[in-house]
Interface confidence: medium
């Protein structure tokens, strides 16, 4: 998939917990796979610009060619620009690599907004600020694209970290992370800490506006506070999870939980917004509007067209509610909730007409492809993609933006019955649709 617009307190949470609150589990986590503790060399290895995705530096070929690569948990191809393009400062030059092998096979990936196509091959790949290994991986050399690369984004390729089932042209093309785990002793786990900017950025500041960490092979405990809570990966294609309840400032949306996962719910670092199915979006906006009714905003704001602006430094965060998503827990009938603040779902942007004010875009939007927990959600949390144990962990990020009154939260356990019923079963047809247009 591809970006659209398409990228340390009291909790202040209102409302009763869902059902019976269970006694708090011990803070001792069950043993994690892989190395634990400190991954100093990988901390702060992500860069990016608000709304344009987070990228990591990678090297490809022999001698190594350095490229910035978008980290995307919503797709499964490792694809890099391999021909001149007006938006690329550099690109992969296969003819200069002595280790490049042509697979004599093309790949074509259409998106709602654009496409890329290229030629498949393999080459040696490493991550300078990652594990000290080099692996031979599949690479799609992008020779032609339309509305894929973003002007000024500073990345030249995409690292799809999801599963082979959604790889193009088909699931026989092994994704990069599978190759990495197979060819090394690196545990089958990675974790992401995406750190949003939290304030509007002018052209100069935007050059190095957001950062974060991709920890390959384990968990770095310095990147989160509190404990990690895990939700099962429902199916290994996208990183699909199940949402069992949604609250706005503690008020339950009271929808059939199947609606929250219609037709799936995924965790996707390559999407900017929190995207919700139409019915859920409408209910959520109605509830957020009601909760923030001390100020009236134009309809165009809620629909993503207009910005809201306040005099610099006067954004009234307190009038906006928190959004809580309850995720299926690892234990039967147990769930936990992740709570984001307006500091996550109001995305700072520069008004094209004036730069005096602090302006924001409503970063919750409508989806026709299910719930997408994009950067808006991920910027509040340290997210662990524990592939080995088929689960995704959430903990409060040490770098999330908050104020003196509220902080993002991960809390549990809560008793929730019949959570399996919340998953939507997609009719068995050829699953060839690409999730796209990722605002």
């Amino acid at each position: 998939t591809h970006l659209g617009i398409r990228l340390p307190l009291r909790s202040g949470l209102a409302g009763p917990p869902l059902g019976l609150r269970l006694p708090r589990e011990t803070d001792e986590e069950s043993e994690e796979p892989g190395r634990r503790g400190s991954f100093v060399e990988m901390v702060d290895n992500l860069r990016g610009k608000s709304g344009q995705g987070y990228y990591v530096e990678m090297t490809v070929g022999s001698p190594p060619q350095t490229l910035n690569i978008l980290v995307d948990t919503g797709s499964s191809n490792f694809a890099v620009g391999a021909a001149p393009h007006p938006f690329l400062h550099r690109y992969y030059q296969r003819q200069l690599s002595s280790t490049y092998r042509d697979l004599r096979k093309g790949v074509y990936v259409p998106y709602t907004q654009g496409k890329w196509e290229g030629e498949l091959g393999t080459d040696l790949v490493s991550i300078p600020h990652g594990p000290n290994v080099t692996v031979r991986a599949n690479i799609a050399a992008i020779t032609e694209s339309d509305k894929f690369f973003i002007n000024g984004s500073n990345w030249e390729g995409i690292l799809g970290l999801a599963y082979a089932e959604i790889a193009r042209p088909d699931d026989s093309l092994e994704p990069f992370f599978d190759s990495l785990v197979k060819q090394t002793h690196i545990p089958n786990i990675f974790s992401l800490q995406l750190c949003g900017a939290g304030f509007p950025l002018n052209q100069t500041e935007a050059l190095a506006s957001v950062g974060g960490s991709m920890i390959i092979g384990g968990i770095d405990h310095s990147l989160y506070t509190g404990r990690l809570w895990y939700t099962p990966i429902r199916r290994e294609w996208y990183y699909e999870v199940i949402i069992v309840r949604v609250e706005i400032n503690g008020q339950d949306l009271k929808m059939d939980c199947k609606e929250y996962n219609y037709d799936k719910s995924i965790v996707d670092s390559g999407t900017t917004n929190l995207r919700l199915p139409k019915k859920v979006f409408e209910a959520a906006v109605k509830s957020i509007k009601a909760a923030s009714s001390t100020e009236k905003f134009p309809d165009g704001f809620w629909l993503g067209e207009q910005l809201v602006c306040w005099q610099a430094g006067t954004t009234p965060w307190n009038i906006f509610p928190v959004i809580s998503l309850y995720l299926m827990g690892e234990v039967t009938n147990q769930s936990f909730r992740i709570t984001i603040l307006p500091q996550q779902y109001l995305r700072p942007v520069e008004d094209v007409a004036t730069s005096q004010d602090d302006c924001y875009k409503f970063a919750v939007s409508q989806s026709s492809t299910g719930t997408v927990m994009g950067a808006v959600i991920m910027e509040g949390f340290y997210v662990v993609f524990d592939r080995a144990r088929k689960r995704i962990g959430f903990a409060v990020s040490a770098c999330h933006v908050h104020d003196e009154f509220r902080t993002a939260a991960v809390e549990g356990p809560f008793v929730t019955a019949d959570m399996e019923d919340c998953g939507y079963n997609i009719p068995q047809t050829d699953e060839s649709t690409l999730m796209t247009g990722r605002a």
Partner: antibody
Framework: QVQLVQSGAEVKKPGSSVKVSCKAS????????ISWVRQAPGQGLEWMGN????????NYAQKFQGRVTITADESTSTAYMELSSLRSEDTAVYYC?????????????WGQGTMVTVSS | EIVMTQSPATLSVSPGERATLSCRAS??????LAWYQQKPGQAPRLLIY???TRATGIPARFSGSGSGTEFTLTISSLQSEDFAVYYC??????????FGGGTKVEIK
């Protein structure tokens, strides 16, 4: 500089449909809204609806609900407005216009207009 | 829907004089209002947005004021190229984003 270029004039029979296109060039397409506004001869401006390509579904004025369909093709940066069950009072110049990226949803860039004549 | 009412329907002014156009909303739209100018055979052109901010390239003789339900467009010294029809549009609710009926500024 963003430009919106519309398709040419159309003459249609009552009861038929017309589809007008609006191609954007020179700027971002998908994250802005494209509105359609019509103007009957000697009359004022009438807002028909709009679409934010990246968010999908269009919004329509009640008056046109069920008769108008606004779509966008992001791959070609083109928006479309289709009006069905045409009647003589639909004779008008149809404009597309862009908004977005600011606190206000003002229509800052307009197409040149497409004259649609409905006549038997 | 919000109804926008413009007055007068026609304003006859001599070149060099001041023109004051009025726009009233049936309910408060805050400062979410724009003014457009349209000349015969041309597409409308944005003049003012946010009730009082001039669009890029619009001369200083055009100014907008007001908020809530009452708005005014003032042209301080009419030039020959300013004779046109002027429309206000509320940018607060949609659908629909309603326009006023227009004020025609003609040469006296």
């Amino acid at each position: 500089q963003v430009q919106l270029v519309q398709s040419g004039a159309e003459v249609k029979k009552p009861g038929s449909s017309v589809k007008v296109s609006c191609k954007a060039s020179g700027g971002t397409f998908s994250s802005y809204a494209i509105s359609w506004v019509r103007q009957a001869p000697g009359q004022g401006l009438e807002w028909m609806g709009n679409i934010i390509p990246i968010f999908g579904p269009a919004n329509y004025a009640q008056k046109f609900q069920g008769r108008v369909t606004i779509t966008a093709d992001e791959s070609t940066s083109t928006a479309y407005m289709e009006l069905s069950s045409l009647r003589s009072e639909d004779t008008a110049v149809y404009y597309c216009a862009r908004s977005g990226g600011t606190k206000y949803g003002m229509l800052d860039v307009w197409g040149q207009g497409t004259m649609v004549t409905v006549s038997s | 829907e919000i109804v926008m009412t413009q007055s007068p329907a026609t304003l006859s002014v001599s070149p060099g004089e001041r023109a004051t156009l009025s726009c009233r909303a049936s309910q408060s739209v805050g400062s979410n209002l724009a003014w457009y100018q349209q000349k015969p055979g041309q597409a409308p052109r944005l003049l003012i947005y946010g009730a009082s901010t001039r669009a890029t390239g619009i001369p200083a003789r055009f100014s907008g004021s007001g908020s809530g339900t009452e708005f005014t467009l003032t042209i301080s010294s009419l030039q020959s190229e300013d004779f046109a029809v002027y429309y206000c549009q509320q940018l607060y609710t949609w659908p629909p984003r309603t326009f006023g009926g227009g004020t025609k500024v003609e040469i006296k």
